[in-house]
């Protein structure tokens, strides 16, 4: 069975996957389209890279700007780094500008919703 | 068959509100978002904002923030536009479109509501 | 805001004559993020052209786009009565989401 295949059977219960189930998936050439990932929980989301969600989304990758105001993909944005959304193409825009240190506060970023960011 | 589904015109007093359905049958509303779309004097045309039916999370163009509220009802798979203090300057015609997620562009439209604001 | 600039506002063709549309942006957008519909009078519009350059389900082979950056354009090659329609660029390249004016193509 190859990656869509797989993919088409486990497509109605991914609502509720865990990271760790998102980040194996991306290593199986799932393809997988912008209404599955839009449903995802967004604390499964936030923890990709930017590789890991080409990999999930493949080709349907583009779709993330037009979703780019939208949760999860939005909070995803916010998380990644601008310079690796840029080797993206699409034009995504409100990552973490570059020079800028990523302080994992979970105190902070459960009251503000993002997370902390030092200055160069 | 595609079908986005509007209510027919409105004729409203200035300062009253009024609340426009779009229902939405043929596809899996899930699987789109609904875009809000104003058309006045048949002349050009301004994104209102748009609703994700999965979340219920709108975006709306910042010269309608505070005017217009976008929310939907999975379970009727209708999304609604509620415009608020109205005056003489929301008369126009409103068309919900539909976006397929991780798409740009609406594939298919309602036909349109218009809404007259006078007194 | 991108502001999309569409040029002529109205125009008369005759049939078979060849028609060509702009549509300039105030700043420069990713080209697969411009659009084209079709709207005639008491009706919606209709989605016409996506990415610039890609036809939409049932558009006649007569119609085509093509730009990049800051200037686009959308070309009848003969015209047909059928046609005579308004045509709107948009763009969803950066938020928020923006239309052209319009061009209003009448039949001579």
């Known amino acids: 069975m190859n990656g869509s295949e797989y993919f088409v059977k486990i497509q109605s219960f991914l609502g509720g996957a865990p990271t760790e189930d998102l980040k194996a998936l991306s290593q199986q050439n799932v393809s997988m389209d912008l209404a599955t990932f839009m449903k995802l929980r967004t604390d499964a989301v936030l923890p990709l890279t930017v590789a890991e969600v080409q990999k999930l989304l493949g080709p349907h990758v583009e779709g993330l700007k037009a979703e780019e105001r939208h949760r999860p993909v939005r909070d995803w944005i916010l998380r990644q780094r601008q310079d690796d959304l840029d080797t993206l193409g699409l034009g995504l825009q409100g990552g973490i500008p570059n020079g800028y240190l990523v302080l994992d506060l979970s105190m902070q970023e459960a009251l503000s919703g993002t997370p902390c960011l030092l200055g160069p | 068959d595609v079908q986005l589904q509007q209510s027919g015109p409105e004729l409203v007093e200035p300062g009253a509100s009024v609340r426009i359905p779009c229902k939405a049958a043929?596809?899996?509303?899930?699987?789109?978002?609904v875009d809000w779309v104003k058309q006045s004097h048949g002349q050009s045309l301004e994104w209102i904002g748009d609703?994700?039916?999965?979340?219920?999370?709108?975006i709306y163009n910042q010269k309608f923030e505070g005017k217009a509220t976008l929310t939907v009802d999975t379970s009727s798979s209708t999304a609604y536009m509620e415009l608020r203090s109205l005056t003489s300057e929301d008369t126009a015609v409103y068309f919900c479109?539909?976006?397929?997620?991780?798409?740009?562009?609406?594939?298919?439209w309602g036909q349109g509501t218009t809404l007259t604001v006078s007194s | 805001q991108v502001v999309l600039t569409q040029s002529p506002a109205i125009m008369s063709a005759s049939p078979g004559e060849k028609v060509t549309l702009t549509c300039g942006a105030s700043?420069?957008?990713?080209?697969?993020?411009l659009y084209w519909y079709q709207q005639k009078p008491g009706s919606s519009p209709k989605l016409w052209i996506y990415?610039?350059?890609n036809l939409a389900s049932g558009v006649p082979a007569r119609f085509s786009g093509s730009g990049s950056g800051t200037s686009y354009s959308l070309t009848i090659s003969s015209m047909e009565a059928e046609d005579a329609a308004s045509y709107f660029c948009?763009?969803?390249?950066?938020?928020?989401?923006?239309f052209g004016g319009g061009t209003k193509v009448e039949i001579k």
């Open positions: 948009h763009q969803w390249s950066s938020y928020p989401y923006t």
């Open positions: 990415s610039t350059s």
């Open positions: 700043s420069s957008l990713i080209s697969k993020y």
């Open positions: 609703v994700n039916p999965n979340t219920d999370g709108a």
């Open positions: 479109a539909r976006r397929r997620l991780g798409q740009g562009g609406f594939d298919s």
């Open positions: 043929g596809h899996t509303f899930t699987d789109y978002n």
